[in-house]
Amino acid sequence: SEVEYRAEVGQNAYLPCFYTPAAPGNLVPVCWGKGACPVFECGNVVLRTDERDVNYWTSRYWLNGDFRKGDVSLTIENVTLADSGIYCCRIQIPGIMNDEKFNLKLVIKPAKVTPAPTRQRDFTAAFPRMLTTRGHGPAETQTLGSLPDINLTQISTLANELRDSRLANDLRDSGATIRIG
């Protein structure tokens, strides 16, 4: 089931998606699409990165975080009710049947009537707390570094905290990384 994220009409919406590059700048293609992740690629692509850069985007959709460090979280600018729905973040790891697929549900609420606009929170790369875990099957001879890592199964359980947290840069500053797979 999809993790749900909320935003108000006129605000920017934030949909988190992360991976760990094998080395700085050693990027993996990522696509974002409107609609649930299909068997291959993304449907209705709104943004795409390649091994070097963002190579396709549409208006109002951008990456606010540092995608060169694996933060490929999507920001949708000035949302309307029509932006509600499922979005797919697909991390396109080379080889067959390796892609990591994340379906995220965006719910847009009508804007509250407020006396003055408030500044949109900065959600650049925040996980307010993380349990780190290693161990993915048997010990292996081929690993690239021994970074602390976070099992992605934990992400969905922390999604609500992520949305409401103001601790934006603690995780990045700690050097922790998220482990895919």
Partner: antibody, heavy 124, light 106 residues
Framework: EVQLQQSGAELARPGASVKLSCKAS????????MQWVKQRPGQGLEWIGA????????RYTQNFKGKATLTADKSSSTAYMQLSSLASEDSAVYYC?????????????????WGQGTTLTVSS | DVQMIQSPKSMSMSVGERVTLSCKAS??????VSWYQQKPDQSPKLLIY???NRYTGVPDRFTGSGSATDFTLTISSVQAEDLADYHC????????FGSGTKLEMK
């Protein structure tokens, strides 16, 4: 300890269908692809298809589309393969195998645990 | 589909000899090649993945090498328990396997 326990040998008539099972234990069933592989006597291995129980994603090789149907029951951590319209050339040992996929950091892509195999004999 | 061609079909060796098995892919598969050992009446077992990485618990007499289209499995000093069929497989695209090499003892 990871284990894949397959159902027992099957004898079937031409034209019939059979459903083979593979019960997984010792790991999180929904987090790994389950693959199915065919081996005819004295021959090599032939990949049939795979299912990802976590989201129900299924892949088939062209040769087995319409022949094999893969399903998975998350509650019992069991994968199934139904083979239909059986013919003598479907006589083989069928293996289920867990797939360890690559991450952005480590290249894997291999079959790391295999079931003991189910022997299917198709004969009139 | 990517074709994987193994050679030889079979070979007869004496204990202590060096064995080299070959596997050629019909197109570039990078290093997405694994080697599996299958003893008589048993399931296959993973030996090598990523063309050259020895799987957990595999004796160091087994070594994999190669990339792109040409791959080799070497057994530096063959033992009686190595009597088996050896299969190479690629997993860059949907998995395909070679037809196997049968290793027999003289």
């Amino acid at each position: 300890e990871v284990q894949l326990q397959q159902s027992g040998a099957e004898l079937a008539r031409p034209g019939a269908s059979v459903k083979l099972s593979c019960k997984a234990s010792g790991y999180t069933f929904t987090s790994y692809w389950m693959q199915w592989v065919k081996q005819r006597p004295g021959q090599g291995l032939e990949w049939i298809g795979a299912i990802y129980p976590g989201d129900g994603d299924i892949r088939y090789t062209q040769n087995f589309k319409g022949k094999a149907t893969l399903t998975a029951d998350k509650s019992s951590s069991t994968a199934y393969m139904q083979l239909s319209s059986l013919a003598s050339e479907d006589s083989a040992v069928y293996y289920c195998a867990r797939w360890e996929k690559s991450t952005t950091v480590v290249q894997r892509n291999y079959f790391d645990y295999w079931g003991q195999g189910t022997t299917l004999t198709v004969s009139s | 589909d990517v074709q994987m061609i193994q050679s030889p079909k079979s070979m007869s060796m004496s204990v202590g000899e060096r064995v080299t098995l070959s596997c050629k892919a019909s197109e570039n598969v990078g290093t997405f090649v694994s080697w599996y050992q299958q003893k008589p009446d048993q399931s296959p077992k993973l030996l090598i993945y990523g063309a050259s990485n020895r799987y957990t618990g595999v004796p160091d007499r087994f070594t994999g090498s190669g990339s792109a289209t040409d791959f080799t499995l070497t057994i530096s000093s063959v033992q009686a328990e190595d009597l088996a069929d050896y299969h190479c497989g690629q997993s860059y695209s949907y998995p395909t396997f070679g037809s196997g090499t049968k290793l027999e003892m003289k």
